[in-house]
Amino acid sequence: GKPIPNPLLGLDSTGELETSDLVTVVLGQDAKLPCFYRGDPDEQVGQVAWARVDPNEGTRELALLHSKYGLHVSPAYEDRVEQPPPPRDPLDGSILLRNAVQADEGEYECRVSTFPAGSFQARMRLRVLVPPLPSLNPGPPLEEGQGLTLAASCTAEGSPAPSVTWDTEVKGTQSSRSFKHSRSAAVTSEFHLVPSRSMNGQPLTCVVSHPGLLQDQRITHTLQVAFLAEASVRGLEDQNLWHVGREGATLKCLSEGQPPPKYNWTRLDGPLPSGVRVKGDTLGFPPLTTEHSGVYVCHVSNELSSRASQVTVEVLDPEDPGKQVDLVSAS
């Protein structure tokens, strides 16, 4: 507010207080409460009384700056109030409130007694910003096939209330709610999506903005969507390759999933022939014989689901006249 000179002084003083309506400081920083008397060169400041103004109780003295006695800090503010470092102008009644805490937020006033101009006073509001410490909590495990599901929630508490938003390429919806406390507010934002495998590995970033932060705070969560693709078998594209004596024949089971799936091979009409080796998703055959003909089943599974795909292997024997006709007709 505009400093109010004392009426009824009967003096034509052009003096005024230079101050600030609002002083903003971040929690833990020192707050400078300004109160500088700008007057004529021959005027003197006798004392500056600083008080914290309570709307109901009255006022609590912080300190008294006296031209003769120096700085006197009231017991409640001992070790917390000092004058700005030298050099100091004798007309400067400003004080430093060290290590500002939330309880310091409120209204303050300085009352300046000058000679010969009389008294002046000004008041200001101290605002203590409490920067948030955001936390991100992933939602329940995401699985392809679910409907709209909570991917993550992000909570930040501060004073004033922080802003919580999401930065991501993933399609989804965000909703926020806020809880007011006596001196702060907690904001929680939730991000919901319909899980799909294309979201796997995509970043979901919580962005927290607050006047007490030099830059936005960002916490990134990498999306994991559980899924299991249909299985298929590769290796039988050219049946003519599956003939007796061929070496290095393999069947490869194709699938993908999150978490990565495990593979297993079985033979439908009996055990796997001797010499046939299972190596993860691949079934390796020794030199082919007609014994290797049969129905092979690839089993794919992860924590979410399991899939299977089967193929019929027919090993051709060029020596077998009955099969020669098939070969010719197949070509």
Epitope: N6, V53, T59, H72, V73, E109, R111, S113, S119
Partner: antibody
Framework: EVQLQQSGPELVKPGASVKISCKTS????????IHWVKQNHGKSLEWIGR????????IHNQNFMGKATLTVDKSSSTAYMELRSLTSEDSAVCYC?????????????WGQGTLVTVSA | DIVMTQSPTSLVVSLGQRATISCRAS??????????MHWYQQKPGQPPKLLIK???NLESGVPARFSGSGSGTDFTLNIHPVEEEDTATYYC?????????FGGGTKLEIK
């Protein structure tokens, strides 16, 4: 309950000194400034000065510079005022006082007063 | 120093009537929020007792028949209806700056 208990009446000769005490109880001594007030017989009240018990900082009324010395003893939660070079003008009741809980201004608690009589 | 001028110096009021005591400061003792003016009651042989702080705030335990008003330089203490126990001397005091000063006092008598 906040209490300020002052020492008893004093009869002293001109030129001498006297030290009166103000023992406090019912609150944390170092959290409130102690003020001293003089009242001449049948007259008004005059603020002598104040002392911060936490650090011993003192502010006097200029009229009492050199006349009144304010001290505290934190261990006994007691404030003292010594008056020196006494004259008959110094004959008065002296009070110690303290502000209330909600604010620093207005003296909500007073000692019962100590009568100082300066007479040959 | 701020000079506090009280009037009248003495006052006689009938039981049940209104007593009005005035106090003028030599300069304003008011901020937009509060006036740094307080009122005390003193009975013989006793220390002063705080009645009103900040011009109009009744101190805890003080009867509601006491009220204070005013701002700037002019302040008033009202007692209505007066009772016999209100016989005392009343003082105003400012706490705007050091030194704090008191008014000369108003002696109230009830008839």
């Amino acid at each position: 309950e906040v209490q300020l208990q002052q020492s008893g009446p004093e009869l002293v000769k001109p030129g001498a000194s006297v030290k009166i005490s103000c023992k406090t109880s019912g609150y944390t001594f170092t959290e409130y400034t102690i003020h001293w007030v003089k009242q001449n017989h049948g007259k008004s009240l005059e603020w002598i000065g104040r002392i911060n018990p936490k650090n011993g900082d003192i502010i006097h009324n200029q009229n009492f510079m050199g006349k009144a010395t304010l001290t505290v003893d934190k261990s006994s939660s007691t404030a003292y005022m010594e008056l020196r070079s006494l004259t008959s003008e110094d004959s008065a009741v002296c009070y110690c006082a303290r502000s209330g809980y909600g604010s620093s201004y207005g003296f909500a608690y007073w000692g019962q007063g100590t009568l100082v009589t300066v007479s040959a | 120093d701020i000079v506090m001028t009280q009037s009248p110096t003495s006052l006689v009021v009938s039981l049940g009537q209104r007593a009005t005591i005035s106090c003028r400061a030599s300069q304003s003792v008011t901020t937009p929020r509060y006036s740094y003016m307080h009122w005390y009651q003193q009975k013989p042989g006793q220390p002063p007792k705080l009645l009103i702080k900040y011009a109009s705030n009744l101190e805890s335990g003080v009867p509601a028949r006491f009220s204070g008003s005013g701002s700037g330089t002019d302040f008033t203490l009202n007692i209505h209806p007066v009772e016999e126990e209100d016989t005392a001397t009343y003082y105003c005091q400012h706490s705007w700056e050091i030194p704090y000063t008191f008014g000369g006092g108003t002696k109230l008598e009830i008839k």
